[in-house]
Interface confidence: medium
């Protein structure tokens, strides 16, 4: 895969992921009422980061915002912060990456500058994706904790739990926004990794200086330093190919093991 293609694909993947992070942040269905024990209910409750909603069996739906930070759990506010930081970093990453795209010429910007901008945007996308994944995971953990606590309360007859609007009768489980957030965070992360890989392809190869003649005793042979490299597969001609082969494997690894970040 060429540098331009990898960079462009990384940008598109990050853009899709970024859009998903915004969508997840705005969605109301971060937690939804668990209907396992009560599949036929007159009211279906679901909650987002910014408001909670009620949908009746008739289809009537109404939402109301969390007007203050007063009774909201610190974890929820932390998740809000992580998602917003992810969005802000994503916006900056997109702006930087637009200028860094190899297919777009801006003034006399050389490949070195574009490489630095590509790396910067890649890092921003990676951090943005990680913020989203952590934010969604923290919320999911909060839900799991509350779910089991409310399950215990059902059988012990205790009162409602704190956290989100948690009552003895109502338990909440994962909403669609969590899955959107996880996928979006992963895509943004992958896109960022691809941008970082593309940066390595954009970096001018300092070892490709002009050929110099070395005069050995009794012989007059010209050596091209890049020649040996090319024959071993490490020359400038095949550098991109080698790195992108590795890049493809990284992407596969990322999809197979979404919790491993040690190679980022």
């Amino acid at each position: 895969m060429s540098v331009t293609a990898c960079q462009g694909l990384g940008f598109v993947v990050s853009l899709i992921g970024f859009a998903g992070i915004i969508a997840a942040t705005c969605m109301d269905q971060w937690s939804t009422q668990d209907l396992y024990n009560n599949p036929v209910t007159a009211v279906f409750n679901y909650q987002g980061l910014w408001r909670s909603c009620v949908r009746e069996s008739s289809g009537f739906t109404e939402c109301r915002g969390y007007f203050t930070l007063l009774g909201l759990p610190a974890m929820l506010q932390a998740v809000r912060a992580l998602m917003i930081v992810g969005i802000v970093l994503g916006v900056i990453g997109i702006l930087v990456s637009i200028f860094a795209l190899k297919c777009i010429r801006i003034g006399s910007m050389d490949d070195s500058a574009k490489a630095k901008m590509t790396l910067t945007s890649g890092i921003l996308f990676i951090i943005s994706g990680i913020c989203a994944i952590i934010g969604v995971s923290v919320f999911a953990n909060m839900l799991v904790t509350n779910f089991w606590m409310s399950t215990a309360n059902m059988y012990s007859g205790m009162g409602g739990m704190g956290g989100m609007v948690q009552t003895v009768q109502t338990r909440y489980t994962f909403g669609a926004a969590l899955f959107v957030g996880w996928v979006a965070g992963g895509l943004t992360l992958i896109g960022g990794v691809m941008m970082c890989i593309a940066c390595r392809g954009l970096t001018p190869d300092d070892s490709n200086f002009k050929a110099v003649s070395y005069h050995a005793s009794g012989q007059n042979v010209a050596y091209r330093p890049g020649g040996f490299k090319a024959s071993t597969g490490f020359g400038s001609n095949t550098r991109n190919k080698k790195i992108y082969d590795g890049g493809a494997r990284t992407e596969d690894d990322e999809q197979s093991h979404p919790t491993k970040y040690d190679y980022v």
Partner: antibody, heavy 124, light 104 residues
């Protein structure tokens, strides 16, 4: 002008039943959740229960749960409260109240209209 | 279960500022009601700090930490009444015990 007029109060024997009505006018009744709130003589306000705008969901306070039923007839712009197994501690002025919302939020934070109340006395 | 806690009484001279607190609620939604003897309650503040039409500007609401406050600036004699805060405890609506505002 929003008007809520309660009726049906009076003296009831312990263990007896009563049905309160609330006639609403001056607003689109079918668009708002409605509540019943009571106040024992010389005491504070107590949330009895709430019904959504469509009548699809109802919630009740712990003191009346299992003994109270709130219903509404949107065609007649009327709210009802049926109370069974009445006790002396149910003696109070019962207010019909309008929420600013359409859904049942189990909340007493946004009641923007109240009736004048009807007194229910449970005594032998 | 949550409880809304209010001071039983607050006394203030005419023209001064009265502050009535309410603490212990849930999820940040509070309303304030004024009730004069023999009358039904009247909503004076909703959503912590919003004033319904027809309510004088001297009534305002604020929140700090886990406490909301009803502030009446330039108290007048007609403001003497019982004031209740309302909210919810995640399973039912609840009211504070009420605060009697006395204008000296």
């Amino acid at each position: 002008e929003v008007q809520l007029l309660e009726s049906g109060g009076g003296l009831v024997q312990p263990g007896g039943s009563l049905r309160l009505s609330c006639a609403a006018s001056g607003f689109t009744f079918r668009s708002y959740a409605m509540m019943w709130v009571r106040q024992a003589p010389g005491k504070g306000l107590e949330w009895v229960g709430e019904i959504s705008s469509t009548g699809g969901s109802t919630y009740y306070g712990s003191a009346v749960k299992g003994r109270a039923t709130i219903s509404r007839d949107n065609s007649k712009n009327t709210l009802y409260l049926q109370m069974n197994s009445l006790r002396a501690e149910d003696t109070a002025v019962y207010y019909c109240a309008k929420s600013t919302y359409g859904a049942t939020w189990k909340s007493a934070d946004s009641i923007d209209a109240w009736g004048q109340g009807t007194l229910v006395t449970v005594s032998s | 279960s949550y409880e809304l806690t209010q001071p039983p009484s607050v006394s203030v001279s005419p023209g001064q500022t009265a502050r009535i607190t309410c603490s212990g609620g849930y999820n940040g939604h509070y309303g304030w009601y004024q009730q004069k003897p023999g009358q039904a309650p009247v909503l004076v503040i909703y959503s912590n700090n919003q004033r319904p039409s027809g309510i004088p500007e001297r009534f305002s609401g604020s929140s700090s930490g886990t406490t909301v406050t009803l502030t009446i600036s330039g108290v007048q004699a007609e403001d003497e009444a019982d004031y209740y805060c309302g909210g919810y405890d995640s399973s039912a609506g609840i009211f504070g015990g009420g605060t009697k505002l006395t204008v000296l």
